[in-house]
Interface confidence: low
C-alpha cells in the first residue's frame, strides 16, 4: 500500500484520522519537513527571551535575549547576563578583571595580557582591564642601523587565548 503521507509538504501533517489527508499545521505549530505525522509546537520567546523570528507553519520561532543579556547554547537555549568591558561574570555577578588580565567584550572571561617579550618584542601600549597590551618592535629593531620599525602586532581575534 502506498504511503500517502510522503506527499504531505512542510507546513502540513499527515492526518491518519482523515484517510491520510494532508492537514495544515494548527496555529502555533509547524512542520519543517514533508511527510510528518505531527506538527511540532512553536517555541515561545517569553521572559528573558524575545522573538527574533516569528514561528511559521514551516519553521520554528527563533529567540534572542532581551537587552542586558546574550545568548548561550544551541539556538539560544539560554540567556546569560552581560557584563561591562573589563569585567567577567562570576557566580556572584560581574567582577572587574584582575590586574594583568582584560576582557574587551560584554561576555566571556578575563584573559591574560599578551606577553610581548615571548616574541622578542617590547610593550608599545600598556594593557588595561578592557584592552590587551600592544606589542611594539623588538629592541633589536630599534638599534642604530636597523631598518624602519615593524608595525605593532595585530590584535588577536576575540575569544582566542594567548598561546
Amino acid at each position: 500500500l502506498q504511503d500517502l503521507c510522503s506527499n504531505c509538504p512542510a507546513g502540513t501533517f499527515c492526518d491518519n484520522n482523515r484517510s491520510q489527508i494532508c492537514s495544515p499545521c494548527p496555529p502555533n505549530s509547524f512542520s519543517s519537513a514533508g511527510g510528518q505525522r505531527t506538527c511540532d509546537i512553536c517555541r515561545q520567546c517569553k521572559g528573558v527571551f524575545k522573538t527574533r523570528k516569528e514561528c511559521s507553519s514551516t519553521s520554528n520561532a527563533e529567540c534572542d535575549c532581551i537587552s542586558g543579556y546574550h545568548c548561550l547554547g544551541a539556538e539560544c537555549s539560554m540567556c546569560e547576563q552581560d557584563c561591562k568591558q573589563g569585567q567577567e561574570l562570576t557566580k556572584k555577578g560581574c567582577k572587574d578583571c584582575c590586574f594583568g588580565t582584560f576582557n574587551d567584550q560584554k561576555r566571556g572571561i578575563c584573559r591574560p595580557w599578551t606577553n610581548c617579550s615571548l616574541d622578542g618584542k617590547s610593550v608599545l601600549v600598556n594593557g588595561t582591564k578592557e584592552r590587551d597590551v600592544v606589542c611594539g618592535p623588538s629592541p633589536a629593531d630599534l638599534s642604530p642601523g636597523a631598518s624602519s620599525a615593524t608595525p605593532p602586532a595585530p590584535a588577536r581575534e576575540p575569544g582566542h587565548s594567548p598561546q
Epitope: Q44, V48, G93
Partner: nanobody, 124 residues
C-alpha cells in the same frame, strides 16, 4: 500538575507601592529559577525580573531597576515582587513564570509555565 497563582494586584496611585505574590505548586520550587513578566494594554510581554532557585542571584530590567525587588520564600513555595515608586507606565498584567529546566547556575532557560496574571493599575 504545575500551578502558579498570582495575587496582590490592584489600583494604586503614582508613587505608591504594591507587593505581588505567586503561590507555586506541583514542582520542587527551590530547584527552579523564577521570573516576573508583564504585559501592558496593547503591548507584548515584557520581562521584568528573575531570581535563581536559591534566591542568591537576582536580575532586573532597566525599566524597574531600583524600584522593584524580587524575592522568594522557598519554605512557603512563594515568589514575591515588591514594587515601589510606581508609575503610570507600570500599569500591566503581571505574570510569574517557572524556568523550564532545574539548574544550579545563574542561567535562565526558557520559561515554560506562566500563571494567569494579576492586574496592576497605576492611576490618580
Amino acid at each position: 500538575e504545575v500551578q502558579l497563582l498570582e495575587s496582590g494586584g490592584g489600583l494604586v496611585q503614582p508613587g505608591g507601592s504594591l507587593r505581588l505574590s505567586c503561590a507555586a505548586s506541583g514542582f520542587t520550587f527551590s530547584s527552579y529559577a523564577m521570573s516576573w513578566g508583564r504585559q501592558a494594554p496593547g503591548k507584548g510581554l515584557e520581562w521584568v525580573s528573575a531570581i535563581s532557585g536559591s534566591g542568591g542571584s537576582t536580575y532586573y530590567a532597566d525599566s524597574v531597576k531600583g524600584r522593584f525587588t524580587i524575592s522568594r520564600d522557598n519554605s512557603k513555595n512563594t515568589l514575591y515582587l515588591h514594587m515601589n515608586s510606581l508609575r503610570a507606565e507600570d500599569t500591566a498584567v503581571y505574570y510569574c513564570a517557572k524556568e523550564k529546566v532545574a539548574t544550579t547556575g545563574d542561567y535562565y532557560y526558557d520559561m515554560d509555565v506562566w500563571g494567569q496574571g494579576t492586574t496592576v493599575t497605576v492611576s490618580s
